[in-house]
Each structure stands twice: as structure tokens, then as C-alpha cells.
Amino acid sequence: APTSSSTKKTQLQLEHLLLDLQMILNGINNYKNPKLTRMLTFKFYMPKKATELKHLQCLEEELKPLEEVLNLAQSKNFHLRPRDLISNINVIVLELKGSETTFMCEYADETATIVEFLNRWITFCQSIISTLT
């Protein structure tokens, strides 16, 4: 059973992940560049279901394309290079979802823009955090 300390750790990690995702979204929304149009054409895969920490597998698998799409920006809108930012997110995701069980992600039929994708995972973080508090 999860202890109060492990729950607190999970909550802090989720809050960190939430902030990172919000930072990326803000960076995109404040971004004025010819490459933005190109960035918005990329279609990301969305989870069929995202209600538990194990479903973060679906986010993990899309982190590489997310990094490559963010790389197009070559902007100062992000405090970190996309590579470092995504690396940080990856570490948090791996810790949150755990590596003991191998969960096969199921994707929804509809794909999403980078904005819709980020909003979906921001909502996921907020939802899980609310159940922990």
C-alpha cells in the first residue's frame, strides 16, 4: 500500500511534470515563427485511456517526436533546449509509471496537434494530482 511519503513524492513528481508540460505549451502559444505552422501539422498519438500512472507509457513513447517537433522552434521561448527539457520529462515519467510492469499502450484512432496533445497530458496530471490531495 502506498505510504504518505510515497504519495507525496508522486504528487511532487506530477506537479513537476505538469509545470514542464505547461511551460512547453506556453512557449508554443507565445511563439511567432514560420516553423509554427509546420509544428502544428504534426499529428501526435493520443492514449485511448489515461486514468492511471501506467498510462504514462503512452506519453513516454511520444516524447521523441515531441522533442523533434520542438527542435523546429530553435527559439528562446524555452528555458532549456528541447533535448534537456524532454530528458527531464522522461526521467519523471519513468519514475512515475515504474519499470516493473510492461504496459502496452493503446492509442485512440484520432491523432492530435501538439497543442491538443499537451493539453491532454496536462489534464491527466491535474486529474491524478486531484485524487492524491
Epitope: 509546420r38 501539422t41 504534426f42 498519438y45 521523441k64 517526436p65 492509442y107
Partner: antibody, heavy 118, light 107 residues
Framework: QVQLVQSGAEVKKPGASVKVSCKAS????????INWVRQATGQGLEWMGW????????GYVQKFQGRVTMTRNTSISTAYMELSSLRSEDTAVYYC???????????WGQGTLVTVSS | DIQMTQSPSSLSASVGDRVTITCRAS??????LGWYQQKPGKAPKRLIY???SLQSGVPSRFSGSGSGTEFTLTISSLQPEDFATYYC?????????FGQGTKVEIK
Amino acid sequence: QVQLVQSGAEVKKPGASVKVSCKASGYTFTNYDINWVRQATGQGLEWMGWMNPNSGNTGYVQKFQGRVTMTRNTSISTAYMELSSLRSEDTAVYYCARSRQWLVLDYWGQGTLVTVSS
Amino acid sequence: DIQMTQSPSSLSASVGDRVTITCRASQDIRDDLGWYQQKPGKAPKRLIYVASSLQSGVPSRFSGSGSGTEFTLTISSLQPEDFATYYCLQHISYPWTFGQGTKVEIK
């Protein structure tokens, strides 16, 4: 980590067929197209076509149309490229590489040497 | 089909040199172009995608520029491990086509 592992070298006689496999790991196989590129010894790269592992849809370069077939087995995350009516000019290293929209050919297999000789 | 013409087909350079390779498309391909490096006996490796975005893990001495029909790959300061053959690839429309390659050799 993402890996594309291809089958071993093949020696075939003219007129025969060859089937090269490409096993994907480290990502969701159905999320990326598989492309096939070949390279004759000392020559440049030649794109042969693509296959969508999710739908099975394919697109082939006209010069290979009727001779090439790209298929997949999603249960084992493996793509195949079969080339028939082989001739000596088909002697080359055949590579598989994945792509997704405009993120193209980011990971490659190690290559499979196909030698066509009588 | 879109033709991709690379120049030069080969060049000799020394370590530390600035090297520029050009790729010209037979029609407008916007920025749907990638650059690949290949060493003997190895699979190609992507360096640049969408004309100017550096592949993660690729040294910053590599850069890409251009759009439309004229594209450039620049190596700002050639290193011993950069001696290889470089290819451009257009992927705006099928069939995708590669340039004929540029072999970078040691002077």
C-alpha cells in the same frame, strides 16, 4: 531504445526471389511507416517504397512496381520486403528505415546484402 | 519525379576546414529535406531534418539551411570522424529521391 534488426545476407540466382525482414523494437511498430532503401556497391542511395504497418498500405517506386512486395506481421513487429525476378543489377545492400509524417528515415536497420549471381 | 542534384560530388578538405555541400531540387520542395551521413559499411545516419533542424545527438558544427530549391549543409570545423559521404533527401512527394552523394575526403 529504438532498433531495426534485419535478416542476414542472401545469395540468389537470377530469376529467383528474395525476402528480407526487418524486426522493430523500442517503439510502437504501427505508429511509424517502414521504408526500404537500397544501395548497390559504390553507388548512392535509392528509395524503393514505403509500407504502413497499421493499415498495410504500400507505395512503390515505379521501377520496382510488379516486382516488389512490402508486407508486415504486426504481432511480431516485423516488416518484409520481397523482390522477385532478380537480376544482377539487384545486387545491393537493402536497408529498412522508419518514418512518420515529416520525421523521415530517423532510424535505420543495419542493412542486408543481397547478391544475385549465377 | 523530383531530381536532387548535389555538388560537389567529392571534395578534399583538412581537419578544421569549413565545408559546404549544396543540394538543388528540380522544383520547390519547401523545407521537406533531410541530410544524411554514411560511413563505409554502415547504415546512413540522419544529421538534419526539415532543412535546418539538427538531429538530437549530432554535433552543433553541422548545420543546414535553405528552402524552396537551394539547400546547404555546412560543417563549420571538419573533424576526423566527419570524413564520409553525405546525401540529401527530398520527401515532399513520392517517390522520395536522394542526391547522388558528396564524398568528403582527407586532403
